[in-house]
């Protein structure tokens, strides 16, 4: 806390300018009017204030706006934003995408801090949903943003926003998140033709059900092994050898290298060895010839 002292004669700040960097902390406190600072916040970034001087400036704004800063000030905080705590940010009402961009810029290239996470949360809650422009902005700054949301939060993403999602934005998503995103993507891309549709839907397929995979197998899509390995095990298990062969096309040879990993391992265990042999890949572990396969899950469902 800076002691209250009178401003020395001739040092009262008429504007926020470079001369203030030579003021001591107590002089800044005594000689800079908080209202002047608020109206000239855009100048602060251009002035190389020290860490301690920034503490004083923040303190002055906190005193002027105890209920939270207005957006006109927030938009021009610049690197002073990095001084804010999540508690400070929770008092804000940020509605402009430009304000959000300006503050994210200050943290660019760095991990999402608690301050940034709080800011985004406030912004999205204020908008009511993750619209396309917001999602565009957030994934541009934080490619992993989408996968940091809970399935419940993802449910507020409108299908139209899915167009903003790039494959790398889904890299860290788990199956529960893809379960929510996949139906939205399917809806968003439904009017595209076969090959274009597959290019767009491919990164969301970790949430696809069996019937959609079966449909894709009829379209000569040539799914790569990396995508196949991310599919839901429960969606892959009911696929026949012929369907998997059609789904993967020339990439089917890659199954051999993955035969000990899920979902390939579990899928092999469900196939007749005869059928697996038709692939000519030497896949082992299928059901031997002459054995009867009982689908217990079907039996349970019927009883």
């Amino acid at each position: 806390e800076v002691e209250k002292t009178a401003c020395p004669s001739g040092k009262k700040a008429r504007e926020i300018d470079e001369s203030l960097i030579f003021y001591k902390k107590w002089e800044l406190e005594a000689c800079v009017d908080a209202a002047l600072l608020a109206t000239q916040m855009d100048r602060v970034n251009a002035i190389p204030f020290t860490y301690e001087q920034l503490d004083v400036l923040k303190h002055k704004l906190d005193e002027l706006y105890p209920q939270g800063y207005p957006e006109s000030v927030i938009q021009h905080l610049g690197y002073l934003f990095l001084k804010m705590s999540p508690e400070d940010i929770r008092k804000w009402n940020v509605t402009s995408l430009e304000t959000l961009k300006a503050l994210l810029e200050v943290n660019k290239g760095h991990e999402m801090s608690p301050q940034v996470a709080t800011l985004i949360d406030r912004f999205v809650k204020g908008r009511g949903q993750l619209d396309k422009d917001t999602l565009d902005t957030l994934t541009a700054f934080y490619p992993g943003y989408l996968c940091s949301l809970s399935p419940e939060e993802l449910s507020s993403v409108p299908p139209s926003s899915i167009w903003a999602v790039r494959p790398q934005d889904l890299d860290t998503c788990d199956p529960r998140q893809l379960d929510v995103l996949y139906p939205k993507a399917r809806l968003a891309f439904q009017n595209m033709n076969g090959s274009e549709y597959f290019v767009k839907i491919q990164s969301f397929l970790g949430g696809a059900p069996t019937e959609d995979l079966k449909a894709l197998s009829q379209q000569n899509v040539s799914m790569d092994l990396a995508t196949f390995m991310k599919l839901r095990t429960d969606a892959v298990l009911p696929l026949t050898v012929a369907e998997v062969q059609k789904l993967l096309g020339p990439h089917v040879e890659g199954l051999k290298a993955e035969e000990r990993h899920r979902p390939v391992r579990d899928w092999i265990l469900r196939q007749r060895q005869d059928d697996l042999d038709t692939l000519g890949l030497g896949l082992q572990g299928g059901i031997p010839n002459g054995y009867l396969v009982l689908d217990l899950s079907m039996q349970e469902a019927l009883s």
Partner: nanobody, 118 residues
Framework: QVQLVESGGGLVQPGGSLRLSCAAS????????YGWYRQAPGKGLELVAI???????NYADSVKGRFAISKDNVNNTVYLQMNSLTSEDTGVYYC????????????WGQGTQVTVSS
């Protein structure tokens, strides 16, 4: 990690000149500004000169016209050319840099002693 190493200090007669250097290493982020502070015997830290990333320079009134701050971006080195030195300029001079993207942090060197005396 970031290291700032000052050199060039020493004993000089009134009216003489010195050139201080500050070599910065371990910098993996854009620097907002470099500066020089000094601490005279028995006094507090005083900002002497500062140079922003864009090259804008600012000086304390007490050194205007006598001191010049400059930087070599290639070698990450900052200089303080001090002319017409007086006994008032005696003190420990500290190099300083500001980080303002992703994190607010100020880094300091260990200081170099400047003594102006006849």
């Amino acid at each position: 990690q970031v290291q700032l190493v000052e050199s060039g200090g020493g004993l000089v007669q009134p009216g003489g000149s010195l050139r201080l250097s500050c070599a910065a290493s371990g910098i993996t982020f854009p620097v907002n500004a470099y500066g020089w502070y000094r601490q005279a015997p028995g006094k507090g830290l005083e900002l002497v000169a500062i140079i922003s990333a864009g090259g804008t320079t600012n000086y304390a009134d007490s050194v205007k016209g006598r001191f010049a701050i400059s930087k070599d971006n290639v070698n990450n080195t900052v200089y303080l050319q001090m002319n017409s030195l007086t006994s008032e300029d005696t003190g420990v001079y500290y190099c300083y840099l500001q980080r303002r993207i992703g994190m607010l942090r100020d880094y300091w060197g260990q200081g170099t002693q400047v003594t102006v005396s006849s």
